[in-house]
Amino acid sequence: AVLTQKQKKQHSVLHLVPINATSKDDSDVTEVMWQPALRRGRGLQAQGYGVRIQDAGVYLLYSQVLFQDVTFTMGQVVSREGQGRQETLFRCIRSMPSHPDRAYNSCYSAGVFHLHQGDILSVIIPRARAKLNLSPHGTFLGFVKL
Amino acid sequence: AVLTQKQKKQHSVLHLVPINATSKDDSDVTEVMWQPALRRGRGLQAQGYGVRIQDAGVYLLYSQVLFQDVTFTMGQVVSREGQGRQETLFRCIRSMPSHPDRAYNSCYSAGVFHLHQGDILSVIIPRARAKLNLSPHGTFLGFVKL
Amino acid sequence: AVLTQKQKKQHSVLHLVPINATSKDDSDVTEVMWQPALRRGRGLQAQGYGVRIQDAGVYLLYSQVLFQDVTFTMGQVVSREGQGRQETLFRCIRSMPSHPDRAYNSCYSAGVFHLHQGDILSVIIPRARAKLNLSPHGTFLGFVKL
């Protein structure tokens, strides 16, 4: 269809904030459960600890986690799982001070990736019981369809 | 031409990952050589240590480098060279811990800039023999034409 | 109207760099005054310490501040004020080394948000007399209308 000025600008977007974060007893990871704070378009679906891609294409993905942890390095890994395989897209790493009063760092990263229909995107902190700050303006995850 | 729904969304994009990193003897810098991991459109061309702009316009540029170095501050400078002059676009700076086991930080930055046809974009670490982690999900460079 | 190939790509963008930074005597904050370095479109207006939204919509916002300060944690808060209320959109936090020679960190964050006509966007450092580096490639603020 011919595009109107209004249609032209409608990139699908999704900005998510945390509901909670949990660690499985048998794995050295902490996962974040997400809820939408801003949504435009129907191509992305928050689903527990992941986001399901319903509309394949090229996306700008961004992730920030706010850490309050004295573990020497902290960070998050953004991965996609689909078509029987898992792939790390990008990660953020931050060295942390050893003193609890100073151990306070946000870690932001982003990139452009091709996502397939049915992919599940997730943010994993490769530490059991990682101490995160789940404030919606400190820890978040987002997608823009390009 | 009238745009179809598909044409509407075709921002040119380029996401690059490292091939290697080298230092010049006569300059206190480390440069990264790039290869495309994702490409859409023909307006950008990876070219050794730089990216050549073939299609002028406004771009979102992003850069991340993963440092494993005890030098007290590390970081990268994203510059463009063209029309006989060089210009720093943005830079990322990270203080590093002095203990090698803790000296592990990614540094991400991004911004929107007008790039000219023929410009060469490069990422320089203003340290000779900087210790980088060249994992494709830790160190990368990207462009989105807006 | 039917869009031409050229019209299709005209996202409004604004990239701002600092003019100066000041602290009010009666408040524990430092504010940055901004000037445009790149502008496309008329929907955003730099206005002293803030940016006025003239064209409502969904925007990618990004902010970086370069800190040279030994205060144990530094960072910036990006907020919008409008319709009688203030809302924090996102923040960046960085632990700083205690030694002045090492206390050198950029803090970058970004996200996608719905902004309303008349909103005033600002970047606040919640520290009086924060030591910032106001280099235009170290401290900046940007908007892309999606």
Partner: antibody, heavy 121, light 107 residues
Framework: QVQLVQSGAEVKKPGASVKVSCKAS????????MHWVRQAPGQGLEWMGY????????KYNEKFKGRVTMTSDKSASTAYMELSSLRSDDTAVYYC??????????????WGQGTTVTVSS | DIVMTQSPSTLSASVGDRVTITCKAS??????VAWYQQKPGKAPKLLIS???NRDSGVPSRFSGSGSGTEFTLTISSLQPDDFATYFC?????????FGQGTKLEIK
């Protein structure tokens, strides 16, 4: 306390080379770069470049590339600046000055006393 | 290269006067500007860094201000020891560059 002590005055003929030394004390030599700045008689200051003793890497002002060589000796906490193919307009006082390890964005906080180099036939 | 233009080139003043020296950069250098004092036959001495930060041991009568392209060094009340030449310098981008200097002399 921080001190930078430079070598003595030199008189050289055109076409010759000169090597100036700068011995540092009172701080960790490898944590700071050493800048070299010159000042012609009655003139202003001109930045020539720096040497980073941490990795023995120089950064030169393009104007001097090909003629200047900056080196350092960590064991002696000493930086060196050698200028070749000397001309009469290289007659100047040459200063070393300490800058922080991430050289950009930091001023030069301590300076040597200067070394006078005279180029004359 | 960034050009740093200092004015005036010479300034005559008396003890107790308030004096201001200005420096204009040919492009935006943020607040990455230093001011140095130099006396005849001596090395420059750092007074101000980051446009406004007094170095340790520098008297409070010296102050710096500005960002972007316009910078000022102010001496609030001249003392006999202040008669010297003053240089500004940008260290935002290579090559680092200096102003041509302002000679402050006794009126």
């Amino acid at each position: 306390q921080v001190q930078l002590v430079q070598s003595g005055a030199e008189v050289k003929k055109p076409g010759a080379s000169v090597k100036v030394s700068c011995k540092a004390s009172g701080y960790t030599f490898t944590s700071y770069v050493m800048h070299w700045v010159r000042q012609a008689p009655g003139q202003g200051l001109e930045w020539m470049g720096y040497i980073n003793p941490y990795n023995d890497a120089p950064k030169y002002n393009e104007k001097f590339k090909g003629r200047v060589t900056m080196t350092s000796d960590k064991s002696a906490s000493t930086a060196y600046m050698e200028l070749s193919s000397l001309r009469s307009d290289d007659t100047a006082v040459y200063y070393c000055a300490r800058g922080l390890g991430y050289a950009l964005y930091y001023a030069m906080d301590y300076w040597g006393q200067g070394t006078t180099v005279t180029v004359s036939s | 290269d960034i050009v740093m233009t200092q004015s005036p080139s010479t300034l005559s003043a008396s003890v107790g006067d308030r004096v201001t020296i200005t420096c204009k950069a040919s492009q935006n250098v943020g607040n990455n500007v230093a001011w140095y004092q130099q006396k005849p036959g001596k090395a420059p001495k750092l007074l101000i860094s980051s446009a406004s930060n007094r170095d340790s041991g520098v008297p409070s009568r010296f102050s710096g201000s500005g960002s972007g392209t316009e910078f000022t060094l102010t001496i609030s009340s001249l003392q006999p020891d202040d008669f010297a030449t003053y240089f500004c310098q940008q260290y935002n981008i290579y090559p680092f560059t200096f102003g041509q200097g302002t000679k402050l002399e006794i009126k």
